[in-house]
């Protein structure tokens, strides 16, 4: 038997993916475990194999269909179970009734690009990936810029309180290398959390022109 405290957390990416992490103190490393998803009003169910991510936690992605297909709606409730093999039988280790649109974590924004760069300014755009049409424009973004000699954790957060897939960074230093990241969160969902940060976009401001400033 497996004893200890267990935590089973899952997020829906709003389209066709439920990502789950299961943590179990005192779990057996060589036990084969999986997550099983059983929607209350769909004809399909789905399973994924839990793979270790640390000493006592496992993760897996339930792929529900094509990446941009709307596989669940706000009305769906999905029973999620962690099942671990015990000899010839499967034992239920954790269970939850999962409301997908109360537990959202979108994919990280993609396609970051510099639209225009000057000595003190940089305009950057991005796209959201695999986000449901349900959200309309009701998304918010956080962005951060890495300056030389600082860490990401020290970078101040810029908040965009609407679906605005661009930003104009001001008061930058000329001829300086920066990095930029952005993340997204829907307004919907009691347990919704921020997406992962995007891949960093590196850019360099233009050098100041001699005798004048652009």
């Amino acid at each position: 038997a497996v004893n200890g405290t267990s935590q089973f957390t899952c997020f829906y990416n709003s389209r066709a993916n439920i990502s789950c992490v299961w943590s179990q103190d005192g779990a057996l490393q060589d036990t084969s475990c999986q997550v099983h998803a059983w929607p209350d009003r769909r004809r399909w169910n789905q399973t994924c194999e839990l793979l270790p991510v640390s000493q006592a936690s496992w993760a897996c992605n339930l792929i529900l269909g094509a990446p941009d297909s709307q596989k669940l709606t706000t009305v769906d409730i999905v029973t999620l179970r962690v099942l671990c093999r015990e000899g010839v039988r499967w034992r239920v280790m954790a269970i939850q009734d999962f409301k997908p649109f109360e537990n959202l974590r979108l994919m990280a924004p993609i396609s970051l690009q510099v639209v225009h760069v000057e000595t003190h300014r940089c305009n950057i755009s991005w796209e959201i990936s695999q986000a449901s049409h349900y959200f309309e424009r009701h998304l918010e973004f956080e962005a951060r810029t890495l300056s030389p000699g600082h860490t990401w954790e020290e970078a101040p957060l810029l908040t965009l309180k609407q679906k605005q897939e661009w930003i104009c960074l001001e008061t930058l230093t000329p001829d300086t290398q920066y990095e930029f990241q952005v993340r997204v969160k829907p307004l919907q969902g009691e347990f919704t959390t921020w997406s992962p940060w995007s891949q960093p976009l590196a850019f360099r401001t233009k050098p100041a022109a001699l005798g004048k400033d652009t």
Epitope: Q70, T73, T74, V75, F101, E102, H133, Y134, F135, E136, H138, L187, Q188, E190
Partner: antibody, heavy 117, light 107 residues
Framework: EVQLVQSGAEVKKPGATVKISCKVS????????IHWVQQAPGKGLEWMGW????????EYAPGFQDRVTITADTSTDTAYMELSSLRSEDTAVYYC??????????WGQGTTVTVSS | EIVMTQSPATLSVSPGERATLSCRAS??????LHWYQQKPGQAPRLLII???QSISGIPARFSGSRSGTEFTLTISSLQSEDFAVYFC?????????FGQGTKLEIK
């Protein structure tokens, strides 16, 4: 500019069926949800159901499930709501509205349906 | 089905004054509460989503707040165009339900 334009007022006899249209413009109809809401005199607003044009799914409130059918024609950007077995208490203004599943962002002007023998 | 109760049914306030409208859910609905304004002969108009997020284009005098299952719509300084009926709507549980409305009238 987002617009939802509904068909005109209807007078129907008890037991009949009414079909209301909602022609939309100013947004991509194929990737939208269209809701229908009833507002009966002295009864407030009642959500009837929606059609999700991208997923091709409908969802109905239990109180209307047996009598309402919501459809959409993506070639003409028009949604329809059909209510059957009409009774006097179905006398109301019916609204179509665009939104996510959770709230109604833009509304049509309303269609008055009178059920009278 | 979640029952949404609005109070008062009618609220009489003078222009320029503050109006406070209440909406209570029969069970916990998190922040899944939305406010609409309806003027006579017109369709409702969305004002506030998720209890406190203002919709773009809505004047800043409209604000929302939440305490448990009680939600409040506040209009800080009433203008003549604000006299209307206000509805709340929950989207926590299916089917989604509306309150019966509060009529805001000129005192």
């Amino acid at each position: 500019e987002v617009q939802l334009v509904q068909s005109g007022a209807e007078v129907k006899k008890p037991g009949a069926t009414v079909k209301i249209s909602c022609k939309v413009s100013g947004f991509n109809f194929k990737y939208s949800l269209i809701h229908w809401v009833q507002q009966a005199p002295g009864k407030g607003l009642e959500w009837m159901g929606w059609i999700d044009n991208e997923a091709g799914e409908t969802e109905y409130a239990p109180g209307f499930q047996d009598r309402v059918t919501i459809t959409a024609d993506t070639s003409t950007d028009t949604a329809y709501m059909e209510l059957s077995s009409l009774r006097s208490e179905d006398t109301a203004v019916y609204y179509c509205a665009r939104g996510g599943p959770w709230f109604l962002s833009y509304w049509g002007q309303g269609t008055t349906v009178t059920v009278s023998s | 089905e979640i029952v949404m109760t609005q109070s008062p049914a009618t609220l009489s306030v003078s222009p320029g004054e503050r109006a406070t409208l209440s909406c209570r859910a029969s069970q916990i609905i998190s922040n899944n509460l939305h406010w609409y304004q309806q003027k006579p002969g017109q369709a409702p108009r969305l004002l506030i989503i998720y209890g406190l997020q203002s919709i773009s284009g809505i004047p800043a005098r409209f604000s929302g707040s939440r305490s448990g299952t009680e939600f409040t719509l506040t209009i800080s300084s009433l203008q003549s165009e604000d006299f209307a009926v206000y509805f709340c709507q929950q989207s926590n549980n299916f089917p989604y339900t509306f309150g019966q409305g509060t009529k805001l009238e000129i005192k």
